[in-house]
């Protein structure tokens, strides 16, 4: 009689993560008597996957009834496949022995490859806000995919970015892989409503890529522009001075009025107006009693925006001039920007 052969007809099997893998194996003879066992890998370190008579293999079922008379089909199914299950599986015939059964003949092996979807890309931006014209870095990470081939693209408001670096790890063979990409984005004043998108395409996604997004509103800080103007006289000795705080983001802002360097009033931006580009405008006014001053008054509008060093703008109020004349000149002297740090 011809010597028993163990036949594994499939050189390779490709299975999606979560599905069931069928590993086929048949023997050509019933002799010698002894069990069939399945292993992953070869050599002394190989892992026992299924032993018909003994052991706990909750994910493994046999395709046919191994105890049926004249059964020579030793195929198995492995349920709920994960990337960690990838490898070469061997169907091995043992001959009855004592104290241990003796390996008699092995099949040629079936390579199980697992297709696993990448996780949803997670995009993260810089820890601190940055101002327009600065370049900031965004990272995108996705994990757990197999095979290794993957495509990653970056977009800002639908426009593809080119300044990025991507790594897929590990470099060598692995059960699953991770991708890490860093993109550089130059901020503009109009970026409050902008979005950065990381798009990942993989064979398991069937042409429907995964996307991760980051809103630049979390990253950008648009510093305000200040304008101090003197309004027409409201009463005989009173002058109304306004400080226009324009185009700032985020909203967190505190304004302090100083008269000749002395704090007159501090307020926090509350009722702001929003511009189309997502930035905010706010106006504060100060009623100055001119008769209380003998000399010229230097009025300073000092703004602390989002915890940054204060910026200020000053306006010189000439007390010597008649209030009515002074009030009619809305383009009164403006000393220009006088930026300084206040602590």
């Amino acid at each position: 009689e011809e010597e028993l052969q163990v036949i594994q007809p499939d050189k390779s099997v490709l299975v999606a993560a979560g599905e069931t893998a069928t590993l086929r194996c048949t023997a050509t003879s019933l002799i010698p008597v002894g069990p069939i066992q399945w292993f992953r890998g070869a050599g002394p370190g190989r892992e026992l996957i299924y032993n018909q008579k003994e052991g706990h293999f909750p994910r493994v079922t046999t395709v046919s009834d191994l105890t049926k008379r004249n059964n020579m089909d030793f195929s198995i199914r492995i349920g709920n496949i994960t990337p960690a299950d990838a490898g070469t599986y061997y169907c091995v015939k043992f001959r009855k022995g004592s104290p241990d059964d003796v390996e008699f003949k092995s099949g040629a092996g079936t390579e199980l490859s697992v297709r696993a979807k990448p996780s949803a890309p997670v995009v993260s931006g810089p820890a601190a806000r940055a101002t327009p014209q600065h370049t900031v870095s965004f990272t995108c990470e996705s994990h757990g995919f197999s095979p290794r081939d993957i495509t990653l693209k970056w977009f800002k408001n639908g426009n593809e970015l080119s300044d990025f670096q991507t790594n897929v790890d590990p470099v060598g063979e692995s059960v699953s892989y991770s991708i890490h990409s860093t993109a550089k984005v130059v901020l503009t004043r109009e970026d409050v409503h902008s979005q950065v998108i990381c798009e990942v395409a993989h064979v398991t996604l069937q042409g429907d890529p995964l996307r991760g997004t980051a809103n630049l509103s979390e990253t950008i800080r648009v510093p305000p522009t200040l304008e101090v103007t003197q309004q027409p006289v409201r009463a005989e000795n009173q002058v109304n001075v306004t400080c226009q705080v324009r185009k700032f983001y985020p909203q967190r802002l505190q304004l302090t009025w100083l008269e000749n360097g002395n704090v007159s009033r501090t307020e926090t931006a509350s009722t702001v107006t929003e511009n189309k580009d997502g930035t905010y405008n706010w106006m504060s006014w100060l009623l100055v009693n001119v008769s209380a001053h003998r000399d010229d008054v230097k009025l300073t509008c000092q703004v602390e925006h989002d915890g940054q060093p204060a910026v200020s703008k000053s306006h010189d109020l000439k007390v010597s001039a008649h209030p009515k004349e002074q009030g009619s000149n809305t383009a009164a002297e403006n000393t220009g920007s006088n930026e300084r740090n206040i602590y």
């Epitope: 008597v33 370190g45 190989r46 892992e47 008579k53 003994e54 052991g55 191994l66 105890t67 009855k96």
Partner: antibody, heavy 114, light 110 residues
Framework: EVQLQQSGAELVKPGASVKLSCTTS????????IHWVKQRPQQGLEWIGR????????KYDPKFQDKATITADTSSNTAYLQLSNLPSEDTAVYYC???????WGQGTLVTVSA | DIVLTQSPASLAVSLGQRATISCRAS??????????MQWYQQKPGQPPKLLIY???NVESGVPARFSGSGSGTDFSLNIYPVEEDDIAMYFC????????FGGGTKLEIK
């Protein structure tokens, strides 16, 4: 549902024999080994032996070789443990268990007493 | 026969603390790359209940508080955090050559 149903408690005299049964359901009886395990009161677990119901191949712990006989009847999906020449030290709970470690019978208490 | 030496014989642990039980085999229980070592929990009047199989695999339905580790000849069962329901006897078992059991560890609450 997998079940291993063991026969009821036995009171036997020293020197006598007893045959315990383990009737299985919910799985292919011939698929896996059936093991028998002894547990004396407040003691540990002792492996007695096992049978392959597919071909009646048996193995025993040498200590039980002359004491125990394990058989199987595939027509009724039942495994048996026969214990002979019982001394009082064989007073114990005897369990049958499937080769997958998970499924155990509820145990049979054998009391050897004059 | 492969002899399994389990220690300690009894163990008193405070609720929420860690319990570690060791099991040493007289020879390797490796079957190729797989350690054929199991851990069971047994409560009075009940058959043993499988907790861990093949040294480190947690049986379905067993709380994640239970974990197993080791290979070759040295194995351990960890329970963390210990709960009231864990009061029981614990046994290791090898199936590399037939079956043998460790002597058992009685877990009590301090």
């Amino acid at each position: 549902e997998v079940q291993l149903q063991q026969s009821g408690a036995e009171l036997v005299k020293p020197g006598a024999s007893v045959k315990l049964s383990c009737t299985t359901s919910g799985f292919n009886f011939k698929d896996m080994y059936i093991h028998w395990v002894k547990q004396r009161p407040q003691q540990g677990l002792e492996w007695i032996g096992r049978i392959d119901p597919e071909n009646d191949d048996t193995k025993y712990d040498p200590k039980f070789q002359d004491k125990a006989t394990i058989t199987a009847d595939t027509s009724s999906n039942t495994a048996y443990l026969q214990l002979s020449n019982l001394p009082s030290e064989d007073t114990a709970v005897y369990y049958c268990a499937r080769g997958n470690y998970v499924h155990w019978g509820q145990g049979t208490l054998v009391t050897v007493s004059a | 026969d492969i002899v399994l030496t389990q220690s300690p014989a009894s163990l008193a642990v405070s609720l929420g603390q860690r319990a570690t039980i060791s099991c040493r085999a007289s020879e390797s229980v490796q079957y190729y790359g797989t350690s054929l070592m199991q851990w069971y929990q047994q409560k009075p009047g009940q058959p043993p209940k499988l907790l861990i199989y093949a040294a480190s695999n947690v049986e379905s339905g067993v709380p994640a508080r239970f974990s197993g580790s080791g290979s070759g000849t040295d194995f351990s069962l960890n329970i963390y955090p210990v709960e009231e329901d864990d009061i029981a006897m614990y046994f290791c078992q090898q199936s590399r050559r037939v079956w043998t059991f460790g002597g058992g560890t009685k877990l009590e609450i301090k």
